[in-house]
Interface confidence: low
């Protein structure tokens, strides 16, 4: 007879609320325990006092901000992404260092250097970089503009990565693109400096290729006081990879079950 | 005491794998007519004999085909997307149309015009279109080629839609690009003809920007026999929408509960 | 991940998809779909074996996470993740049809 | 959708995103992670109420697929989704450090 | 109901070619997937290839070289080119109609045709 | 490239028995199996696809199963119809089939 059939498959029907509650926090205690490979809290016995670092608060504000250009729903977690992600930022190489000299002259490109000594200091392995993110802090903007950004190649070559349609705005805002695939690969080889290009879209036909979105780190001639906190707010990238120690756990569980 | 509670929450552990697999298959009859808005299984008297129609089956094999430039994971489903889409297709006007004449002469591009009337004819109203796919079948290409598609605004200007980077290959290839606002925009409109640019991507520095890549529908010169098979290949529009009559209902339901 | 490719060629007890093909004509009795005759639906079974109780050994259940309650769930069920439409082929009167109907291929499951 | 939106601001009894706030001090009794204080967890609670049986009326049971079994499961599951990360700050010894974790806020549940 | 009939078969001298013709009837043909199959005298079956609706083809490792499979959707009709013939490419040639189970490209032989014999001998 | 090895390679058996025949995979094809019978002068005939499918209009005494590397194909009661030679075949993602060499049923 259906009707037992229905019975051994469905659960009971009387739930009780708050005891749904406390097994979800409970369930959440050990969540985020195990997302951070630990077996216990941490010991809490050589925190520094007061308050956070200011670059510590700056990085988790930037990790917790949703940017122009991420995916606001994340795609069906693989397995290795159930664990935490630690996250680091390395800026861009200042613009009056030497490597920028020869790519000043255009009107139609910026560019952006990073130590890769920087990189991997921050992701020893590139099989470690779950993500990359770079990020600009584009100022206001008169006119919609579609800009690309390519990656350096060989000495004077540029590989095309994405595009961005910008539409006018009048306040400040930051902008993301998912740079993962090209930092891994910085990671993997042994250059020193490795940059992007952003650039105004030239089509075949059109005459007017100049850049006019304003990015944060590149305008001069600015005050000494707001120099700086515009050189804090220069282009840099957000990583996310999972920490060494943790990583040699993972390998050792890779075979599932 | 936990236990128990535990036994509150929790299915019934002993699952027989028929019964699962009997409800499965009753869970699917219905799933299956309540996403084509049937209360029943509709009459099969009036059904002609003999195969389906080849242009039917073409039609089956292009909505079941994967092709290059299509998401491969659908996104979670907003609601009305849970009901069956009716699939139609809207081949390209034909090259020999003068509506072609004034863009012929170009190397860096090749223009694609559409028939509104057939396509408000397959989808009446803009609002039950839930995908258009532009689809074309590339042939061998032997280098990477980056192209992009524009969409035709007013008399002579184009607004960029897109891009694609094309991997050389020894096979052809179908690309899909996605233009589902274009489209809902086209039938919102009063025109009556509209159409697409697809063009080598023109980097502000670089010289040669010609289209490389061959796209069927577009080569002269060739065979009787072998342009007709050409002909039915041309670039189509994939349409997938609501049909009118299952719009109706879904109005009328709008407010769930 | 618990999809076609491990969990066909393994016999695992917990969470995970499972082999059905729908042959519309022998299983729905139907013969008013055209194409195709049937399809690999599948379906997800098995339990999401985690259960927090005060007695268990705290490393065991935190290793046991990301298998069976990543989400954290108060009571983990073993549901579809990975999902992809069917075309059918089916005539209204004279006139045949082309739809898609989405979700209706389980690729994958997980505990959620 | 059954998100936050909808549930929240509803008496729904079936399947739905309901509301749980974690203070981490309060609730779980740690002072180890320094931002946030706490977060807006929620969970997915509430019965997906369609059961197939020879006596129910066919056209009825049609109507309800498309909220209460979605995915034609033969025991559908309420459950997330749509879910948001959670970064988090605390110390390893004397070093701060800033981690992401995954899938950790519920925005949205369906029946699956 | 499906019929599939194959011909060009016979006698055939070492280093020559060959075409082998398969007509079908009673099914879709222009939507079906193909294959060809052959069988040395008294041994077992071996796989050649198939084609796809598409007209894309696939071939076992051995037949790359010197067996191409194509289609005439028009005409219903499969062939097998086979060239630079050798004595142990002796056998009865079959075609058989592939069966798409939907949402994979897994194969089965779904109906056979009755073969042609090819004897490659001086 | 995937090698299907069937054993035994030849069997007698009498009307009424249970018959057994066994297909190993040298990698796992998970159940995208396929078997087949032929008698003397005639083409092949699909039995079963998906490892245990048994195809429209065979008869029920015919079973398979298996899954992985491992296959079985049963003659619950041979029938005198049922003398012939059984070939199991894979067909996991299509772009390779493979055929086993073949297992003789004689009249003992």
């Known amino acids: 007879d259906y009707k037992d059939d229905d019975d051994k498959l469905s659960t009971s029907k009387t739930i009780d609320m708050e005891l749904v509650k406390r097994k979800r926090i409970e369930a959440i205690r050990g969540q985020i325990l195990s997302k951070l490979r630990l077996a216990s809290p941490p010991s809490q016995g050589e925190v520094p006092p007061g308050p956070l670092p200011e670059a510590v608060l700056a990085l988790y504000n930037s990790t917790r901000d949703r940017v122009a250009g991420e995916s606001a729903e994340p795609e069906p977690e693989p397995e290795a992404d159930y664990y935490a992600k630690e996250v680091t930022r390395v800026l861009m190489v200042e613009t009056h260092n030497e490597i920028y000299d020869k790519f000043k002259q255009s009107t139609h490109s910026i560019y952006m250097f990073f130590n890769t000594s920087e990189l991997r200091e921050a992701v020893p392995e590139p099989v470690l970089l779950s993500r990359a993110e770079l990020r600009l802090l584009r100022l206001k903007l008169k006119v919609e503009q579609h800009v690309e950004l390519y990656q350096k190649y060989s000495n004077n070559s540029w590989r095309y990565l994405s595009n961005r349609l910008l539409a006018p705005s009048d306040s400040p805002e930051w902008l993301s693109f998912d740079v993962t695939g090209v930092v891994r690969q910085w990671l993997s080889r042994g250059g020193e400096i490795e940059g992007f290009r952003l650039s105004a879209h030239c089509s075949c036909d059109s005459k007017d290729n100049t850049l006019q979105v304003d990015i944060n780190g590149f305008t001069t001639g600015r005050r000494g006081d707001l120099a700086t906190i515009h050189g804090m707010n220069r282009p840099f990238l957000l990583l996310m990879a999972t920490p060494l120690e943790r990583a040699q756990h993972l390998q050792s569980s890779r075979h599932r079950r | 005491d936990y236990k128990d509670d535990d036994d509150k929450l929790s299915t019934s552990k002993t699952i027989d794998m028929e019964l699962v697999k009997r409800k499965r298959i009753e869970a699917i009859r219905g799933q299956i007519l309540s996403k084509l808005r049937l209360a029943s299984p509709p009459s099969q008297g009036e059904v002609p004999p003999g195969p389906l129609p080849e242009a039917v089956l073409a039609l089956y094999n292009s909505t079941r085909d994967r092709v290059a430039g299509e998401s491969a994971e659908p996104e979670p489903e907003p609601e009305a997307d849970y009901y069956a889409k009716e699939v139609t297709r809207v081949l390209m006007v034909e090259t020999h149309n003068e509506i072609y004449d004034k863009f012929k002469q170009s190397t860096h591009s090749i223009y694609m015009f559409f028939n509104t009337s057939e396509l408000r004819e397959a989808v009446p109203e803009p609002v039950l279109l839930s995908r258009a796919e532009l689809r074309l079948l590339r042939l061998k290409l032997k280098v990477e080629q980056h192209v992009e598609l524009y969409q035709k605004y007013s008399n002579n200007s184009w607004r960029y839609l897109s891009n694609r980077l094309l991997a050389p290959s020894d096979s052809p290839e179908w690309l899909s690009f996605d233009v589902t606002g274009v489209v809902r925009q086209w039938l919102s409109r009063g025109g009556e003809i509209e159409g697409f640019r697809l063009s080598a991507h023109c980097s502000c520095d670089s010289k040669d920007n010609t289209l490389q890549v061959d796209i069927n529908g577009f080569t002269t010169g060739r065979r009787g026999d072998l342009a007709t098979i050409h002909g039915m290949n041309r670039p189509f529009l994939l349409l997938m929408a609501t049909p009118l009559e299952r719009a109706q209902h879904l109005q009328s339901s709008r407010h769930r509960r | 991940a618990l999809d076609t490719n491990y969990c066909f060629s393994s016999t695992e007890k917990n969470c995970c998809v499972r082999q059905l093909y729908i042959d519309f004509r022998k299983d729905l009795g139907w013969k008013w779909i055209h194409e195709p005759k049937g399809y690999h639906a599948n379906f997800c079974l098995g339990p999401c074996p985690y259960i927090w109780s005060l007695d268990t050994q705290y490393s065991k259940v935190l290793a046991l996470y990301n298998q069976h309650n990543p989400g954290a769930s108060a009571a983990p069920c073993c549901v579809p993740q990975a999902l992809e439409p069917l075309p059918i082929v089916y005539y209204v009167g004279r006139k045949p049809k082309v739809e898609q109907l989405s979700n209706m291929i389980v690729r994958s499951c997980k505990c959620s | 959708a059954l998100d936050t939106n909808y549930c929240f601001s509803s008496t729904e009894k079936n399947c739905c995103v309901r509301q749980l706030y974690i203070d981490f001090r309060k609730d779980l009794g740690w002072k180890w992670i320094h931002e946030p204080k706490g977060y807006h967890a929620n969970f997915c609670l509430g019965p997906c109420p369609y059961i197939w049986s020879l006596d129910t009326q066919y056209s009825k049971v049609l109507a309800l697929y498309n909220q209460h079994n979605p995915g034609a499961s033969a025991a559908p599951c309420c459950v997330p989704q749509a879910l948001e990360p959670l970064p988090i700050v605390y110390y390893v010894g004397r070093k701060p450090k800033v981690e992401q974790l995954s899938n950790m806020i519920v925005r949205s549940c369906k029946c699956s | 109901q499906v019929q599939l009939v194959e011909s060009g078969g016979g006698v055939v001298q070492p280093g020559r070619s060959l075409r082998l013709s398969c007509a079908a009837s009673?099914?879709?043909?222009?939507?079906?997937?193909m294959n060809w199959i052959r069988q040395p005298p008294g041994k077992g079956l071996e796989w050649i290839g198939y084609i796809y609706v598409s007209g894309t083809t696939y071939r076992a490792d051995w037949a790359r070289g010197r067996f191409t499979i194509s289609r005439d959707n028009s005409k219903n009709t499969l062939y097998l080119q086979m060239n630079s013939l050798r004595a142990e490419d002796t056998a009865v040639y079959y075609c058989?109609?592939?069966?798409?189970?939907?949402?994979?490209?897994?194969?089965?032989?779904?109906?056979w045709g009755q073969g042609t014999l090819v004897t490659v001998s001086s | 490239d995937i090698q299907m090895t069937q054993s035994p390679s030849s069997l007698s058996a009498s009307v009424g028995d249970r018959v057994t025949i066994t297909c190993q995979a040298s990698?796992?094809?998970?159940?995208?199996l396929a078997w087949y019978q032929q008698k003397p002068g005639q083409p092949p005939k699909l039995l079963i696809y998906?490892?245990?499918t048994l195809e429209s209009g065979v008869p029920s005494r015919f079973s398979g199963s298996g899954s992985g590397t491992d296959f079985t194909l049963t003659i619950s009661s041979l029938q005198p119809e049922d003398f012939a030679t059984y070939y199991c075949?894979?067909?996991?993602?299509?772009?390779?089939?493979?055929f086993g060499q073949g297992t003789k049923v004689e009249i003992k």
């Open positions: 998906a490892a245990s």
């Open positions: 058989a109609r592939g069966w798409h189970i939907f949402g994979h490209h897994y194969w089965v032989m779904h109906a």
């Open positions: 009673g099914f879709h043909f222009s939507s079906e997937a």
């Open positions: 075949q894979s067909y996991s993602d299509g772009d390779s089939v493979i």
């Open positions: 990698e796992s094809i998970s159940t995208y």
